[in-house]
């Protein structure tokens, strides 16, 4: 059967250096395995940007951090029976 998702480990607030690489982690359980999406300030994060890599284990990696990457990032874990969210604020300086 279907079971609503639970985020076991979500992203954490962090301050990162401009041009560096930082990661956002979202580990979720549920049935079926939850789909993970990321939003930044409410807008879907696109992995079409070559700086942004969707790694395994629910990790979103952002290379060459820019000041414009500052914002609130939200992990959305979804299954057919619901969704769970977890947010963190990233400041690039």
């Amino acid at each position: 059967g279907s079971m609503g998702p639970v985020i076991r480990q979500g992203p954490v607030n962090q301050t990162v250096a401009v041009d560096g690489t930082f990661v956002l982690s979202c580990v979720a359980t549920g049935s079926p395995v939850p789909t993970i999406l990321w939003r930044k300030d409410g807008v879907l994060v696109s992995t079409q940007d070559s700086r942004i890599k969707q790694l395994e284990n629910g990790v979103l990696q952002i290379r060459y951090a820019k000041l414009g990457d500052t914002g609130r990032y939200t992990c959305i874990a979804s299954t057919p029976s619901g969704e769970a969210t977890w947010s963190a604020y990233i400041e690039v300086q």
């Epitope: 041009d19 700086r51 790694l55 395994e56 284990n57």
Partner: antibody
Framework: QLVESGGGVVQPGGSLKLSCAAS????????MSWVRQTPDKRLELVAT????????YYPDSVKGRFTSSRDNAKNILYLQMSSLKSEDTAMYYC???????????????WGQGTSVTVSS | DIQMTQSPASLSASVGETVTITCGAS??????LTWYQRKQGKSPQLLIY???NLADDKSSRFSGSGSGRQYSLKISSLHPDDVATYYC?????????FGSGTKLEIK
């Protein structure tokens, strides 16, 4: 193929510009890195640059002293090093960032290296 | 910064044996680990990426494993050609730090 050049002996405080000539692949589509191997055989990433040269990264140990750039028309990668210190003495390698799935950072082609000695 | 601790610093084994090299990270790196092999007088070569994925041209005698903070590289049925120094690298967040290396010799 990646071929580095420009290494040598330089005094502390001096400058050096390394070059890396690429061939055999479409240079302009790959991010590139510079890695050095110190005399005690440790490896250290000193610069990365994205495919169009618009983004670079340097660790704190070289930030403000090293600058990486590239000329995609000539298939050449550069590392300008200034205010050199004795601890910059190393073998410097240029390397190509692999295009992998999943997209982990990894370097799949390396040059033969060029030696830099900073000594008075 | 994430620190990478490799062990042992060196080891000696006989042809045909299986050896294991370990790499510990100072924090969870979520499988974002790369292994390189550097033979004497040569440039490093990519061996394993994403902790477990074998590079295209490498022998299946090499295998990577681990998660969280602890990782290992196993070399089975040791060949004389495996004599080299092996390095792990954190590739989760910058600086992408390397381990100090493990020098493998044949008895």
């Amino acid at each position: 193929q990646l071929v580095e050049s420009g290494g040598g002996v330089v005094q502390p405080g001096g400058s050096l510009k390394l070059s890396c000539a690429a061939s055999g692949f479409t240079f302009s589509t790959y991010d590139m890195s510079w890695v050095r191997q110190t005399p005690d055989k440790r490896l250290e990433l000193v610069a990365t640059i994205n495919s169009n040269g618009g983004s670079t990264y340097y660790p704190d140990s070289v930030k403000g002293r090293f600058t990486s750039s590239r000329d995609n028309a000539k298939n050449i990668l550069y590392l300008q090093m200034s205010s050199l210190k004795s601890e910059d003495t190393a073998m410097y390698y240029c390397a190509r960032e692999a295009l992998l799935r999943p997209p982990y950072y990894a370097l799949d082609y390396w040059g033969q290296g060029t030696s830099v000695t900073v000594s008075s | 910064d994430i620190q990478m601790t490799q062990s042992p610093a060196s080891l000696s084994a006989s042809v045909g044996e299986t050896v294991t090299i370990t790499c510990g990270a100072s924090e969870n790196i979520a499988g974002a680990l790369t292994w390189y092999q550097r033979k004497q007088g040569k440039s490093p070569q990519l061996l394993i990426y994403g902790a477990i994925n074998l590079a295209d041209d490498k022998s299946s005698r090499f295998s990577g494993s681990g998660s969280g903070r602890q990782y290992s590289l196993k070399i089975s049925s040791l060949h004389p050609d495996d004599v080299a120094t092996y390095y792990c690298q954190n590739v989760l967040s910058t600086p992408f730090t390397f381990g100090s290396g493990t020098k493998l010799e044949i008895k």
